[in-house]
């Protein structure tokens, strides 16, 4: 049925889906607080621009009776139920902020006539790539994949003189939502990562991973996994590791590595951590005081979703353009807007760009140090530490295949 949008005559509404099944186990109250803080900022910015309009949010909760796993497994149906609720109420905002699970976003995108924009804090999977009216404000799997291929091919840095073309991927099925889709993208046989690598094997059992660490017949020295240091320790413990093993630990939404008093545990010495350049202004924010670093990124994405809407609303109002048009729905991409913590850039497909940071553990200081940064917007690597104090021989990353000479 045709749903009218509450989106004209100086009154603009944001529909926020408050789903029980979510990419991160975040109390909905915290997300509400993030949205409300964002609304205050948007109202201030619009008033500052001389635009006397009203902007509000409607929070739409599912009943939680059927879809109560809490993670993303039953999110498909929950998302569609919420859409049905909107349809029955005959009331929709100018924009839909909400689904963070890849399953729910994919299905909702398919099942709606999208003449309005959809903003997601999550939806990491490849199946949510290249959607014309979907904007994703947390780094999707495609961005990770492009970094890894770029890094694998790099062979002209003082600390990386070999191109790599092989990898193991550890994926045991217990991952968080972000990790699940990141690893899923690496595993997919049709993905860019798989296409660019000559050898790739997925390790699904703890024992498989543990055996590879000292297996003389291993096909690659590089293992990609996703999670935090504690996750790695549970798996690896204090087991001996061959000297030319490199573990790439993907831990994007965790800025604990940058805290002043953090010392890297010994088991991290042959690990490179891939994370995002840290933010710091949320620490004083009312809605984020009790959040873990990961959850801070999730709440920040909700807040930035509101600011993005405010940014687009301001542009369209100043240009005298209608908000309830396909042009507005398709406009949330290929732009930079002022987020809560500085400028946020969206690529041509509405996906957030960011600076990824590759860290290593200094054998001298036992601190995490920045090895290089990677700008997802330009797909370019920038070395930071040209003389890293690695654990690896000659302070250089080893070849990915033992015994193979330089290429």
């Amino acid at each position: 049925s045709q749903v009218s949008q509450n989106c004209h005559n100086g009154s603009y509404e944001i529909s926020v889906l408050m789903m029980g099944n979510s990419a991160f186990a975040e109390p909905l109250k915290n997300l509400e607080d993030a949205v409300n803080e964002g609304l205050e900022i948007v109202r201030g910015r619009l008033q500052n621009a001389g635009l006397n309009v009203t902007v509000n949010a409607t929070f739409m909760y599912s009943d939680g009776l059927i879809h109560n796993s809490g993670d993303c497994r039953s999110s498909t149906c929950e998302g569609l139920d919420l859409l049905r609720k909107i349809s029955n109420a005959q009331r929709m905002g100018c924009v839909l902020i909400g689904p963070s699970c890849t399953y729910s976003t994919f299905q909702m995108y398919l099942d709606t006539e999208l003449s309005y924009p959809m903003i997601s804090a999550g939806s990491f999977g490849l199946s949510c790539d290249y959607k014309e009216t979907l904007t994703r404000l947390m780094s999707p799997a495609r961005k990770l994949m492009y970094f890894l291929v770029n890094f694998w091919k790099t062979n002209d840095l003082p600390f990386k003189t070999y191109s790599w073309s092989t990898s193991y991927v550890y994926k045991n099925g217990t991952e968080t939502e972000d990790c699940f889709w990141y690893l899923n993208a690496l595993e997919a046989s049709v993905s860019y990562f798989s296409h660019e690598l000559g050898f790739k094997v997925v390790l699904r059992q703890d024992k498989e991973f543990q055996d590879i660490l000292m297996d003389h017949n291993r096909k690659s020295n590089v293992i990609i996994m996703c999670g935090g240091p504690e996750f790695l320790y549970k798996l690896k413990g204090d087991r001996a590791v061959a000297e030319d093993i490199v573990i790439i630990l993907v831990d994007l939404f965790n800025d604990q590595y940058f805290e002043d008093n953090v010392t890297a545990p010994d088991y991290m010495k042959n690990v490179l951590v891939l994370t995002l350049s840290p933010g710091n202004s949320l620490l004083n924010s009312s809605f984020s005081r009790n959040l873990s670093p990961t959850k801070r990124d999730f709440a920040l994405a909700y807040l930035n979703g509101i600011l993005l809407f405010g940014h687009m609303l301001k542009i369209f109002l100043e240009n005298g353009e209608n908000i309830t048009t396909p042009k507005f729905a398709h406009a949330f991409r290929n732009l930079t807007f002022e987020g809560y913590d500085g400028p946020v850039t969206l690529d041509d497909w509405g996906d957030v760009d960011s600076t990824m940071v590759l860290l290593y553990t200094s054998v001298d200081t036992k601190k995490y140090k920045v090895l290089l940064t990677y700008d997802t917007h330009v797909n370019k690597t920038y070395p930071v530490d040209m003389s890293p104090t690695f654990t690896w021989k000659n302070s250089k990353l080893p070849n990915d295949i033992t015994g193979r000479g330089p290429q």
């Epitope: 900022i41 910015r45 004083n284």
Partner: antibody, heavy 119, light 107 residues
């Protein structure tokens, strides 16, 4: 109550580098862009540039090649350097805080520092 | 960059009279316009933003109007403390730019 206190050398010779620092007291440092604005004697105001707590900078293309703006969040301070100064850079230099994040209009100002360039 | 032009350069008004100051932008700034007052030896003081909204603590005799490229600052009944230089400023885009100022002096 937000206060901006600025300091730096007041007398420079041509070709030297102007260096000013602005300290922020009271209020949040992270929720704003912090600006430098100058005013030659008896003339109007010229916007030099701005920086936020993350080090994101917007600056005036007319001065860009000579301007360096930096931030030290641990001290709630930001700074301006202007290289290769000439007599045309003689002005009162103000630091300022916008009314709200990215608002672009200025509610709080430093006391101003007169910088004279003379041989 | 957007050039802001103010007129007149000097305005002579008697206390109690109304003063009308104009500001023109070289291209549209919508309503992203502010007005400031500056007295000798002091930093500028924000009066108006959003073309017509008074900043905190600014008396009601100050009012702003306009949109796009033409803007006006009106001072309803000039008090002795209102004699100063007034600047308009656009914040639609970077670089932020100011007008050259209008000096409001006692007639």
């Amino acid at each position: 109550q937000v206060q901006l206190q600025q300091w730096g050398a007041g007398l420079l010779k041509p070709s030297e580098t102007l260096s000013l620092t602005c300290a922020v007291f009271g209020g949040s440092f992270s929720g704003y862009y912090w600006s430098w604005i100058r005013q030659p004697p008896g003339k109007g105001l010229e916007w030099i540039g701005e920086i936020n707590h993350r080090g994101n900078i917007n600056d005036n293309p007319s001065l860009k090649s000579r301007v360096t703006i930096s931030v030290d969040t641990s001290k709630n301070q930001f700074a301006l350097k202007l290289s290769s100064v000439t007599a045309a850079d003689t002005a009162v230099y103000y630091c300022a805080r916008e009314r709200g994040y990215t608002y672009g209009n200025y509610e709080h100002w430093g006391q101003g520092t007169l910088v004279t360039v003379s041989s | 960059e957007i050039v802001m032009t103010q007129s007149p350069a000097t305005l002579s008004v008697s206390p109690g009279e109304r003063a009308t100051l104009s500001c023109r932008a070289s291209q549209t700034v919508n309503r992203n316009l502010a007005w400031y007052q500056q007295k000798p030896g002091q930093a500028p003081r924000l009066l108006i933003y959003g073309a017509s909204t008074r900043a905190t603590g600014i008396p009601a005799r100050f009012s702003g109007s306009g949109s796009g490229t033409e803007f006006t600052l009106t001072i309803g009944s000039l008090q002795s403390e209102d004699f100063a230089v007034y600047y308009c400023q656009q914040y639609k885009t970077w670089p932020r730019t100011f007008g050259q100022g209008t000096n409001v002096e006692i007639k």
